[in-house]
């Protein structure tokens, strides 16, 4: 006789799988606030910092009604990776002034990436359809000036925040309707 | 610094009318869903309504229902709430305030709406 | 009559840890997040505790919050005078579509 066969293979609870995966949020929603209000210490923000090169908001409270997993997962993992993207960037090209946010910003980018996989784990579990494979985004100019950098960094962590926010929101919203 | 500034209250007879303004400013306006709250004399507070950041979508609370209207100008920054067929009861300090989320992270100071003959 | 219940009032020492309580039911606490707000003497309120109990920034984490199925409670160690105010607890309620508090309760540091 051949090998005893394996243990049966549980299928995974969609929810516990869905708290697993707002706990990652909540934590790098937090992360990323107590980012965001030391880089306000460290260099005030005068006024509002817009990135054209970032994700458009995806939900509010008019789009919750009509949440769906798929679309929910899709695109926040979607604009997800673009945040990723823009951490490495502001990393890589910020300047000298944004050095002072590490290591605190190579943290947020390593959460960042494992809540990415949590995702992409999440939807394979729950037999979603898989994205195609994102097409090779074209480079982020590094920022004009010292100044460019900062400008920069205010949009995007500020950007990433309301999104984790809104992600929370959205997916305990899921969640009940699992 | 993100700042929330109310204005347009003051004394209105019952049944009368009111346009209250709320500006905004230190943050991105057109990307916060935008709220109305209240708060009577001496009361605890209550959610009057919410606008989407784009002005797609709103949400009232049940006693305001047909009476009360929010709207947005993104361009100017600035949110407002009309009430039409004022009653004694809608006698409060109304405020403003951002969502990000599930929560108010900024509050206006308030502006005092008295509704008397 | 709030849809969320919290006692009218509570107190402690300098010093003391106080807890407030929030009860509500599974269509606003048991499936959505609770947030509480601090309202000083005279002015609005501002946020204390979001999604149950991450501090927003710049609030001392002499507070804390926390929930289990569908109550919520707010703890505050170390009491100070300046804590004198009132606290409201909050959520999303998915019968009623709208934000839902409780009727507040007035902390006094004796």
């Known amino acids: 006789p051949g090998p005893p066969p394996g243990p049966p293979r549980v299928s995974p609870d969609p929810r516990a799988e869905l708290d697993s995966t707002v706990l990652l949020t909540r934590s790098l929603l937090a992360d990323t606030r107590q980012l965001a209000a030391q880089l306000r210490d460290k260099f005030p923000a005068d006024g509002d910092h817009n990135l054209d090169s970032l994700p458009t908001l995806a939900m509010s409270a008019g789009a919750l009604g009509a949440l769906q997993l798929p679309g929910v997962l899709t695109r926040l993992r979607a604009d997800l990776l673009s945040y990723l993207r823009h951490v490495q960037w502001l990393r890589r090209a910020g300047g000298s002034s944004l050095k002072t946010l590490e290591p605190e910003l190579g943290t947020l980018q390593a959460r960042l990436d494992r809540l990415l996989r949590r995702l992409q784990l999440l939807m394979s579990r729950l037999a979603l359809p898989q994205p195609p494979p994102d097409p090779p985004a074209p480079p982020l100019a590094p920022p004009s000036s010292a100044w460019g950098g900062i400008r920069a960094a205010h949009a995007i962590l500020g950007g990433l925040h309301l999104t984790l926010d809104w992600a929370v929101r959205g997916l305990l919203l899921l969640k009940t309707r699992l | 610094e993100v700042q929330l500034l109310e204005s347009g209250g003051g004394l209105v007879q019952p049944g009368g009318s009111l346009r209250l303004s709320c500006a905004a400013s230190?943050?991105?306006?057109?990307?916060?869903?935008m709220n109305w709250l209240r708060q009577a004399p001496g009361k605890g507070l209550e959610w009057v309504g919410v606008?989407?950041?784009?002005?797609?979508?709103?949400f009232y609370a049940d006693f305001v229902k047909g009476r009360f209207t929010i709207s947005r100008d993104n361009s100017k920054n600035t949110l407002y709430l009309q009430m039409n067929s004022l009653r004694a009861e809608d006698t409060a300090v109304y405020y403003c305030?951002?969502?990000?989320?599930?929560?108010?992270?900024?509050w206006g100071q308030g502006t005092l709406v008295t509704v008397s003959s | 009559q709030s849809v969320l219940t919290q006692p009218p009032s509570a107190s402690g020492t300098p010093g003391q840890r106080v807890t407030i309580s929030c009860s509500g039911s599974?269509?606003?606490?048991?499936?959505?997040?609770v947030n509480w707000y601090q309202q000083l003497p005279g002015t609005a309120p501002k946020l204390l505790i979001y999604y149950d109990d991450l501090l927003p920034s710049g609030v001392p984490d002499r507070f804390s919050g926390s929930k289990s199925g569908t109550s919520a409670s707010l703890a505050i160690s170390g009491l100070r005078s300046e804590d004198e105010a009132d606290y409201y607890c909050s959520a999303w309620d998915d019968s009623l579509n709208a934000v839902v508090f409780g009727g507040g309760t007035k902390l006094t540091v004796l």
């Open positions: 606008i989407s950041y784009d002005a797609s979508n709103k």
């Open positions: 599974s269509s606003n606490i048991g499936n959505n997040a």
């Open positions: 230190g943050f991105t306006f057109s990307h916060y869903d």
């Open positions: 305030a951002r969502t990000p989320g599930s929560h108010f992270d900024y």
